[in-house]
Structures are given as C-alpha cells and as structure tokens.
Interface confidence: medium
C-alpha cells in the first residue's frame, strides 16, 4: 500500500483551524490478524529522507497521537491529552486519516508527517509516510481562510517507505 497526501501545502491565518489529511492507497490487507498504526509528527526536510526526524506536535509525541485499530475499523483520539492541546487525529473506513489543529499560531508552521504501519500479529510488516507543509500567516497578507495546494500527482503517488 501507499500513502497519498492530497495537499502538499496548507496556508492558514493565525487563529484558524486546519485539518491535515493523508489517504491510504492500494490493496490493504483486512485480515483479522492485521492492524494499522497511524500517527502524526513534525519533522524537517532532511537532505536524505523527509520525515526521518520525529518531533512533537504541540508537545505531543507521535505516541500520544497514534491510532491503532483493525483494518476495517474507524478510529479517533478521544483522550483528553490531545484535546487539551487543540489536537485530534481521526481515521475513517475509506483509508483517510487526519489531524485537526485548532486555533493555529505562528509556532505551528512547519513540515508535518503522517505515518502508517501495517502490523500483523504485533509485528511491523510495512510502513509508509507522507509529508505536507503548514504555513501559518498573520497580518494583512494572511488569507481569511485556509488555502490548500494540491500535491502534484508525482508527489502524492511517489511516497517513500519510512
């Protein structure tokens, strides 16, 4: 399977909410013994590999933001910790998963990575990630709402295994 990032750039005004999205593509094993671990983290554009570095999002680690569920299940982070930081990650039945960030500040600007790991019998089988940029703007040049820029087909399809 692959991970697609429908949008490679999100430009948002300060104080706005934004939902960053990734999508699971390709054949997904839905066997009873297969689960999916999905999470989000901040990173930087490494010279060798994007998303190799894992940094917290608003002080929450990728472990705090993870979803871990069977292939046929939807899931979301309902725990207070994430919500107290204005964050919620979610996943639906169709392979979409997202992180919603509320009340954006300039400090939220940066590179965000989604990670999906296919797990069979508690062991990591395949892992892929996607990357997208968030720019939070303030002042007269800031848009009134979030503006999203679609990934090129090459960007969204050509995702490297983590």
């Amino acid at each position: 399977f692959k991970v697609a990032t429908p949008y490679s750039l999100y430009v948002c005004p300060e104080g706005q909410n934004v939902t960053l999205t990734c999508r699971l593509l390709g054949p997904v094993d839905k066997g009873h013994d297969v689960t999916f671990y999905k999470t989000w983290y901040r990173s930087s554009r490494g010279e060798v590999q994007t998303c190799s570095e894992r940094r917290p999002i608003r002080n929450l680690t990728f472990q705090d933001l993870h979803l871990h569920h069977g292939g046929h299940q939807a899931a979301n982070t309902s725990h207070d910790l994430a919500q107290r930081h204005g964050l919620e990650s979610a996943s639906d039945h169709h392979g979409n998963f997202s992180i919603t960030m509320r009340n954006l500040t300039l400090l939220d600007s940066g590179l965000y990575c989604c990670l999906v790991v296919e797990i069979r019998h508690h062991h990591s089988e395949h892992r892929v990630h996607g990357a997208m940029e968030l720019q939070v703007q303030t002042g007269k040049d800031a848009p009134s709402n979030c503006v999203v820029y679609p990934s090129s087909s090459q960007d969204s399809e050509n995702i490297t295994a983590a």
Epitope: T35, R54, F62, H68, H69, V117, H122, H123, E125
Partner: antibody
C-alpha cells in the same frame, strides 16, 4: 515506576468463568499492549494473547480463542482477562505483562509483569 | 505451533563459573520482516518472570552484562559469563515470530 497490579486469587467450579484484572500505572496506558501468560502449578509458561488498550483490539492464542476475552477500561488503566468454561487444567497463575515495541510499533518483548493471580478450578 | 526445546533442563553451576543454555526451535523463527523475535526470561523462585534478552542478543535495561544472547535461525544460546547466587531460577526462551508465540520448557539453574 511501571507497575502492573493484578486482582486477588480466585477459586472457581468447573464450567464457571473467571475475570482477572490488571491495573497499569507509571506509564501512558494507551501506548503499550498488554499480554496474558499463564503458568500451571510446577509447569512452564504459556502465552494466551494480547490487547491493544487504545482501540480494544485483541488477538488470542487459538488454543483459548473460544473461551478467552480480553477487554480494557481506559478510564482506570485496567485490562481484564475473562476465561470461560473453566476446567481443572485451567488451574494456574495468570500473569499480565506489558508489550514493548519500537518506534514503528514492532513488538520486541514483554518488559514488565504483574505479580500473578492464582486461579484454582475445583469441584 | 513452533516447539521451543531447551537444554539442559537442569543446570547446577558453581558461583563464578560460566553457564550456557541452549534453545532450539522446531522451525526458523526469522520473521517475514527480517527480525528474529527470540527472548529470554528468568523466573526467580516465587517471583514473576523478568525480561533478560530480546531480539536474540539485546540486553534489557538493568540486566547485568554477564548475560548475553546469541544465535540465528533455529539455534539460540543464553550465556552467563560468571554465575552469581542471585541468578538462580528457571530460564525460559520464547519466540514471538509466529503465532501462537511459544515458550521453551525452562531450564532450572541452581548453585552447586
């Protein structure tokens, strides 16, 4: 420090069910899986299965599949293991253990264990 | 199911001397992802098991460096370079590569 505290000893009659609890503390409950392992008197260890506390997904050793149910209560950081249709061969100490894994959720060991719960099945 | 066979089943050792426990699996325990999930646990008398070694040769934090693990495929070994009195108990190997995960029958280490 990481602690797994299990419920007290139980005596059950054949055909009954038993529900053993395992309360976790000292770490973030939803970051780790919980496994169950049993040990019959004077015997070795036997892996029964595990549960993912964040989602409730569980996977069982086929030997116990029809009789075991693992559940969790995230509000109290507690995992439960229920074994039904008990028989004398189920007399054992039941242990819960935390499943540790790397950054890609790849299991590598059961790193912390509860103190064990003795379940005696006798008529 | 994969059968894990340990030898010897009983191991009397003089303090300060080395000890070695063998564990053989009935088929390879190299997982499809390339890792080998072979662990060693020690159960001291009257206590719960405790983790010593994971993924064949990695010592768990706090485990003395006199304990080491090695092996590949189907043959694995736990070595104690100098046995101490506190090392007594039953040692179990455990494979977590193929469900159901299985333990060896245990090796009882005792002080001579």
């Amino acid at each position: 420090q990481v602690q797994l505290v299990q419920s007290g000893a139980e005596v059950k009659k054949p055909g009954a069910s038993v529900k053993v609890s395992c309360k976790a503390s000292g770490y973030t409950f939803t970051h780790y899986t919980i496994h169950w392992v049993r040990q019959a008197p004077g015997q070795g260890l036997e892996w029964m299965g595990y549960i993912i506390p964040s989602s409730g997904y569980s996977e069982y050793n086929q030997k116990f599949k029809d009789r075991v149910t693992m559940t969790r209560d995230t509000s109290t950081s507690t995992v439960y293991m229920e074994l039904s249709s008990l028989r004398s061969e189920d007399t054992a100490v039941y242990y819960c253990a935390r499943g540790a894994y790397d950054d890609y959720y790849d299991y590598y060991a059961m790193d912390y264990w509860g103190q064990g719960t003795l379940v005696t099945v006798s008529s | 199911d994969i059968v894990m066979t340990q030898s010897p089943l009983s191991l009397p050792v003089t303090p300060g001397e080395p000890a070695s426990i063998s564990c053989r699996s009935s088929q390879t325990i190299v997982h499809s992802n390339g890792n080998t999930y072979l662990e060693w646990y020690l159960q001291k008398p009257g206590q719960s098991p405790q983790l010593l070694i994971y993924k064949v040769s990695n010592r768990f934090s706090g485990v003395p460096d006199r304990f080491s693990g090695s092996g590949s495929g189907t043959d694995f070994t736990l070595k104690i370079s100098r046995v101490e009195a506190e090392d007594v108990g039953v040692y179990y190997c455990f494979q977590a590569s193929h469900v159901p995960w299985t333990f060896g029958q245990g090796t009882k280490l005792e002080i001579k």
